[in-house]
């Protein structure tokens, strides 16, 4: 009966400080509303990156001043994190919760451990 | 720091109603979902009900079904649990209790008592 | 529903041993959807472990939690005079959110 969440273990963000990367579940039921948040976890503190809720067949959108954009298709999501500095190089955490109609189920991925290299700056040109 | 401090609580007759609040503070409540639980005299937890951070949908245990209803004003950083048709069983301890990122009851109010009673 | 039975209902200890409470669940329940709870006469429960294992905010490493499947298990490894209370255990992976019916650690 649990949900099981499962996302890659490791991502590394590409130069412009963006990652990318599948958060894919197993349904218990017939969720017509899902809600996924993105997690960040560091030194056992959990906070909470962004979050969407989507209607089953409908895109899922995050706040307009979030740092997520995401798809969804069936039970994956292809969530994308921007703006990212190596100071926030860590493990995200992929929460699923099906949130309508009952019951109720939440699921919780095992995390991506997200690698942030900040671009060398271009030498000065004389 | 996170405070939750419930309100209402009192004695009433069966077949009344009463309505509790919890007050939430130093944190970001419409980002949560939000719990009751209650405790009869003596006994264990159960769970009562959640109501979701935008307060769009609702769940609540069989045994409350009906009779209770829960909300929240997230301009004013409160939660109301609507009490009907309360019945000698409902009397109890009533937390209110957030739920944590993770899923788990992170942190709890002090209770207030309900006592149902002729 | 989950039904979680907790074993023993009473714990009789002296400070300084070791308590090991069990939670069992009627269905099996992932371990990140199990959570652990201490309350005192008077007070609110307080989170103790969530996730099976992972200690919550300010709780001493005197406290763990071990398991998965249907059996779980609390350990306190030496016991403190603030560590007598109740523990509850309690899954949340889906609704309705149930609790065991709760252990007493009283002294010897």
């Known amino acids: 009966k649990a949900m099981h969440v499962a996302q890659p273990a490791v991502v590394l963000a590409n130069s412009r400080g963006t990652a990318s990367f599948v958060c894919e579940y197993a349904s218990p039921g017939k969720a017509t509303e899902v809600r996924v948040t993105v997690l960040r976890q560091a030194d056992s503190q959990v906070t909470e990156v962004c979050a969407a809720t989507y209607m089953m067949g409908n895109e899922l959108t995050f706040l307009d001043d979030s740092i997520c954009t995401g798809t969804s298709s069936g039970n994956q999501v292809n969530l994308t994190i921007q703006g990212l500095r190596a100071m926030d190089t860590g493990l995200y955490i992929c929460k699923v919760e099906l949130m309508y109609p009952p019951p109720y189920y939440m699921g919780i991925g095992n995390g991506t451990q997200i690698y942030v290299i900040d671009p060398e700056p271009c030498p000065d040109s004389d | 720091q996170v405070q939750l401090v419930e309100s209402g609580g009192g004695v009433v007759q069966p077949g009344r109603s009463l309505r509790l609040s919890c007050a939430a503070s130093?944190?970001?409540?419409?980002?949560?979902?939000m719990h009751w639980v209650r405790q009869a005299p003596g006994k264990g937890l159960e769970w009562v009900a959640v109501?979701?951070?935008?307060?769009?949908?609702?769940y609540y245990a069989d045994s409350v079904k009906g009779r209770f209803t829960f909300s929240r004003d997230n301009s004013k950083n409160t939660l109301y649990l609507q009490m009907n048709s309360l019945r000698a069983e409902d009397t109890a301890v009533y937390y209110c209790?957030?739920?944590?990122?993770?899923?788990?009851?992170?942190?709890w109010g002090q209770g207030t008592l309900v006592t149902v009673s002729s | 529903e989950i039904v979680l039975t907790q074993s023993p209902g009473t714990l009789s200890l002296s400070p300084g041993e070791r308590a090991t409470l069990s939670c069992r669940a009627s269905?099996?329940?992932?371990?990140?959807?199990l959570a652990w709870y201490q309350q005192k006469p008077g007070q609110a429960p307080r989170l103790l472990i969530y996730?099976?294992?992972s200690r919550a905010t300010g709780i001493p490493d005197r406290f763990s939690g071990s398991g998965s499947g249907t059996d779980f298990t609390l350990t306190i490894s030496r016991l403190e005079p603030e560590d007598f209370a109740v523990y509850y255990c309690?899954?949340?992976?889906?609704?309705?959110?149930?609790f065991g019916q709760g252990t007493k650690v009283e002294i010897k």
């Open positions: 209790a957030r739920g944590g990122l993770m899923g788990a009851f992170d942190y």
């Open positions: 130093g944190f970001t409540f419409s980002s949560y979902g």
């Open positions: 109501i979701w951070y935008d307060g769009s949908n609702k």
């Open positions: 269905q099996s329940v992932s371990s990140s959807y």
């Open positions: 996730g099976a294992s």
């Open positions: 309690q899954q949340y992976g889906t609704s309705p959110w149930t």
